[in-house]
């Protein structure tokens, strides 16, 4: 969210369209202060692994959970739409006991035919003692796979184990991986779509197919739009993330499903178990793999990854390290853009997109991934803008 890491001082929030700073009390107050009006359309977020719906209060200049009292599916759809999800993606809403909260946003059902923020007011009480949990899309569910495999020197993945994984082809050749986040949107790496590959017509996405030899022309989805992060730096690979919008939406099934984007408030632990997957080389300087491979890796805290003997301060806040410092397991050429995922609350979350590394599976050279947590606001913004 833009409230963190913006160019403005602690007391200001940056407008994307103009770069100007506005007072937090003018954010989400029902009046557009940014030229592009974005101060009024980024007022809702899902928080933590339980997808708790939070709304920004311009009065209190902070985020508050929404009380369940009188909430219904219509409001849930509107909140999801404001985040950038299309209405027909809407999955479900739940209720989470949040007795720890002391401050809520509540619905005024008699407010009339006005937008959702004008229907919400600040309250210190919530009679249901429950807050709204919102799933804007049924994401992060796979067919259970206990089989361990590795990208470098490993075995193949089982069908449906990584249903969000796509193979991105240029002229019938696998070039990069990607992750499905909605029926229309794929997350990949910005370095995959550097010029001249920034033209969407170069790209075809294949979903739900494990073997490269089965990815023939008719089975692919054409890419309609390629959006690279505006602050991507090709030298340092900072902000190495891109989005692809498909011409036709994917049809979800057991083998094709979206992964969940991480929510603010989700704490990642050093040494947390994650998985990487892709059709990349199974050995350094090797050929692209025929089958989809996957591997367990551990998150490595940035401080260690930035140490003199590892990546010597090349890791920025927009990057995340994973692998094993002793090597052996790693992503490799051709895995770029693919997912780094972790499971929490029985849901799979997209933590990173495969970005770079020094060689493959070398000791003290873990894989480096785009830190998706840093980019979720940007992703939602692109989805909203495309509306």
């Amino acid at each position: 969210w833009k409230f963190m890491g913006s160019k403005c001082s602690n007391s200001g929030i940056e407008c994307d369209s103009s770069g100007t700073c506005i007072n937090p009390s003018n954010w989400c107050d029902g009046v557009s202060h940014c030229p592009g009006g974005e101060d009024e359309n980024r007022c809702v977020r899902l928080y933590g692994p339980n997808f708790i719906l939070q709304v920004y209060s311009s009065q209190r200049k902070s985020w508050h959970p929404v009380c369940q009292d009188d909430w219904n599916e219509n409001y849930g759809r509107a909140a999801c739409r404001d985040m950038g999800y299309k209405n027909n993606f809407y999955s479900s809403q739940g209720i989470v006991d949040d007795s720890g909260s002391t401050s809520f946003m509540k619905l005024n059902t008699s407010a009339g035919n006005v937008d959702i923020y004008k229907k919400l007011y600040h309250s210190d009480a919530c009679s249901s003692k429950a807050v709204v949990s919102l799933r804007c899309i049924a994401c992060g569910v796979n067919l259970n796979s206990s089989r361990q495999s590795r990208i470098v020197g490993g075995e193949s993945a089982l069908p449906g184990a990584w249903p969000w994984q796509v193979s991105l082809h240029v002229q019938n050749v696998h070039v990069c991986g990607g992750s499905i986040i909605t029926p229309e949107w794929i997350v990949t790496a910005a370095h995959c779509v550097e010029k001249p590959l920034n033209n969407p017509w170069h790209w075809t996405a294949f979903a739900g197919i494990l073997r490269q030899s089965f990815m023939f022309y008719g089975a692919g989805y054409q890419v309609e739009k390629v959006i690279s992060h505006p602050n991507y730096d090709s030298k340092t690979k900072n902000n190495d993330i891109a989005l692809m919008k498909l011409q036709k939406p994917l049809t979800f099934n057991d083998l094709v499903k979206p992964v969940c984007l991480p929510n603010p408030g989700m704490m990642l632990q050093p040494e947390q178990l994650c998985w990487i997957s892709g059709w990349g080389a199974t050995e350094e300087k090797g050929k692209t793999s025929e089958v989809l491979n996957a591997a367990k890796v551990l998150l490595i805290e940035t401080q260690r990854c930035n140490s003199r003997y590892v990546y010597d301060n090349l890791i920025t806040p927009a990057m995340i390290c994973a692998g094993f410092l002793q090597g052996n397991v790693d992503s490799c050429q051709g895995d770029s853009g693919g997912p780094l995922v972790t499971s929490k609350n029985n849901i799979w979350w997209l933590i990173g997109d495969t970005s770079w590394g020094s060689g493959c599976a070398k000791a003290y050279r873990p894989g480096v991934y785009g830190n998706v947590m840093v980019f979720t606001d940007w992703i939602y913004r692109q989805m909203r803008a495309d509306g």
Epitope: D70, W71, N72, E73, N74, R77, R81, K86, N87, N88, T109, G112, N113, G387
Partner: antibody, heavy 119, light 107 residues
Framework: EVQLVESGGGLVQPGGSLRLSCEAS????????MHWVRQATGKGLEWVSA???????LYPDSVKGRFTISRENAKNSLYLQMDSLRAGDTAVYYC?????WGSGYLDYWGQGTLVTVSS | DIQMTQSPSSLSASVGDRVTITCRAS??????LNWYQQKPGRAPKLLIY???SLQSGVPSRFSGSGSGTDFTLTISSLQPEDFATYYC?????????FGPGTKVDIK
């Protein structure tokens, strides 16, 4: 005065298509969600589709993939494109305005247009 | 899908009677229950929205109550123009579903 006037109904063969229109007046059309509801002769009311002020659409499973709701705000018009029609789609079709999108109640209804699907 | 049931399916009453119609949802729908009146050959007309709010222009003899799964429409003193079919509708979640209707006719 709020008014909704449906048109486009008629007799069509099974498998055929029909496009219903609903012309709205007396309110700021673009600000309101709109629904289509149908009623077979002597039967109850059945929700058919909805379109939000932002253009987002909703359908029940019974018509999903066959019916398409759309709106043209500049013309204050709501449409229902009905394809692959079946005998079970025979009904009077009403367009209705949602009084408050959040509460979802239908505060104004048109007079209805009859669609008959028969060979 | 949320199923809506109404009882009775029909009733006979006289002018001046107090009439009560109940509507039950298969799961909790909070307060998102609306009542409509329909006369033969006419479009439905909104009477009550969000369980208990009276639509403007609707006589005050009509009232609604309830929340969760059980709701009631009451006509305190039945008038000749009230003989019609009454439908409840939930607008809590999609698909938006209607009750089967209650026909009120003259005894």
């Amino acid at each position: 005065e709020v008014q909704l006037v449906e048109s486009g109904g008629g007799l069509v063969q099974p498998g055929g298509s029909l496009r219903l229109s609903c012309e709205a007046s007396g309110f700021t059309f673009r600000s309101y969600d709109m629904h289509w509801v149908r009623q077979a002769t002597g039967k109850g009311l059945e929700w058919v589709s909805a379109i939000g002020s932002a253009g987002d659409t909703l359908y029940p499973d019974s018509v999903k993939g066959r019916f398409t709701i759309s709106r043209e705000n500049a013309k204050n018009s709501l449409y229902l494109q009905m394809d692959s029609l079946r005998a079970g789609d025979t009904a009077v079709y009403y367009c209705a305005r949602v009084g408050d999108w959040g509460s979802g109640y239908l505060d104004y209804w048109g007079q209805g247009t009859l669609v008959t699907v028969s060979s | 899908d949320i199923q809506m049931t109404q009882s009775p399916s029909s009733l006979s009453a006289s002018v001046g009677d107090r009439v009560t119609i109940t509507c039950r949802a298969s799961q909790s729908i909070s307060i998102y229950l609306n009542w409509y009146q329909q006369k033969p050959g006419r479009a439905p007309k909104l009477l009550i929205y969000v369980a208990s709010s009276l639509q403007s222009g609707v006589p005050s003899r009509f009232s609604g109550s309830g929340s969760g799964t059980d709701f009631t429409l009451t006509i305190s003193s039945l008038q000749p123009e009230d003989f019609a079919t009454y439908y409840c509708q939930q607008s809590y979640g999609t698909p938006f579903t209607f009750g089967p209707g209650t026909k009120v006719d003259i005894k």
